[in-house]
């Protein structure tokens, strides 16, 4: 069966300077390939976090993704600023051998609404 990516919250509100968690779970780790978080869609989308080892300031994974059979790819964004407002998507990719990774499924998105402190 096809992998499903679930983002349970349609939206979260967070005060500027605080932290927020964006939840994402998958039903399967197959096909092999990374999970990435983006803000926005289409041409304007921005890579926010990738579960592939790179360092992303202010963002870290919530659960231990090195553990076998971990299906939780939630992230925590610290010290949220108004520029962080937008819709965040958790996206599952299939690893390509020589060609680029292929996007195969996405969560429904979580809107982050930043409140003035």
């Amino acid at each position: 069966t096809e992998v499903k990516v679930t983002q349970p919250e349609k939206s979260v509100s967070v005060a500027a300077g605080d932290s927020t968690i964006l939840n994402c779970t998958v039903t399967s780790l197959l096909p092999v390939g990374p999970i990435r978080w983006y803000r926005g869609v289409g041409q304007s989308r921005l890579l926010i976090y990738s579960f592939t080892g790179e360092h992303f300031p202010r963002i870290r994974n919530v659960s231990d993704t090195t553990k076998r059979n971990n299906m939780d790819f939630s992230i925590r964004i610290s010290n949220v600023t108004p520029e962080d407002a937008g819709t965040y998507y958790c996206v599952k990719f299939q690893r390509g051998s020589s060609e680029p990774d292929t996007e195969i499924q996405s969560g429904g998105g979580t809107e982050v609404y930043v409140l003035a402190k």
Epitope: K10, S11, Q105, S106, G109, Y113
Partner: antibody, heavy 119, light 108 residues
């Protein structure tokens, strides 16, 4: 049973204002995001505005931004749309629509109220 | 914003025939697509969500399929009450939430 009943439509001149209401019953109103969707005569459906259950999150279509204001009174189970600086192209049936609790599609709709903007 | 294009604009069929309506998205919306039925003087009614899941109380002659950019609503055997206008709506890229232009299914 979910019920959404719109009111407040009517005939106005360009530049005038109107306030639409949507009385909701049959569900926990404050737990659901609500929307206004309109349909101009002979045209398709056009999303107008969205407000979250708490009223914190609000979005508008570009075509109404700066002129329309969405609001809600959870104590009265009522959704509102304040329409200012009305134009002929705002002529439409305005529907109140309840969002699904997980995704942004519409589980339930009202019958709509007709707004006619004409000189 | 994601643009949805529905085809055909009008479908003229007889009761008992099969109706196939298409909705194309300008970019992938995965399976975040809903279908609605609208009849004059009535509230629009949710038929399908998640591209293929039937809403509560919708008869099984209605089925949805597709993912990514291409979607289909099929009415397996048209009943007299199915002659109406049908709209698709994406809820992946939002806001704005966008609808297709509609397909009118009329009686031959």
């Amino acid at each position: 049973d979910v019920q959404l009943v719109e009111s407040g439509g009517g005939v106005v001149r360009p530049g005038e204002s109107l306030r639409l209401s949507c009385a909701a019953s049959g569900f926990t109103f404050s737990s659901y995001d609500m929307n206004w969707v309109r349909q101009a005569p002979g045209e398709g459906l056009e999303w107008v505005s969205l407000i979250s259950g708490s009223g914190e999150i609000i979005y508008y279509a570009d075509s109404v931004k700066g002129r329309f204001t969405i609001s809600r009174d959870n104590s009265k189970n009522t959704l509102y749309l304040q329409m200012n600086s009305l134009r002929a192209e705002d002529t439409a049936v305005y529907y109140c629509a309840k969002e699904n609790n997980r995704y942004r599609f519409f589980d339930d709709w009202g019958l709509g109220t007709l707004v006619t903007v004409s000189s | 914003e994601t643009v949805l294009t529905q085809s055909p604009g009008t479908l003229t069929l007889s009761p008992g025939e099969r109706a196939t309506l298409t909705c194309r998205a300008s970019q992938s919306v995965y399976t975040y697509l809903a279908w609605y039925q609208e009849k004059p003087g009535q509230a629009p009614r949710l038929l399908i969500y998640g591209a293929s899941s039937r809403a509560t109380g919708i008869p099984d002659r209605f089925s949805g399929s597709g993912s990514g950019t291409e979607f289909t609503l099929t009415i397996s055997s048209l009943q007299s009450e199915d002659f109406a206008v049908y709209y698709c709506q994406q809820y992946y890229d939002r806001p704005p939430l966008t609808f297709g232009g509609g397909t009118k299914v009329e009686i031959k």
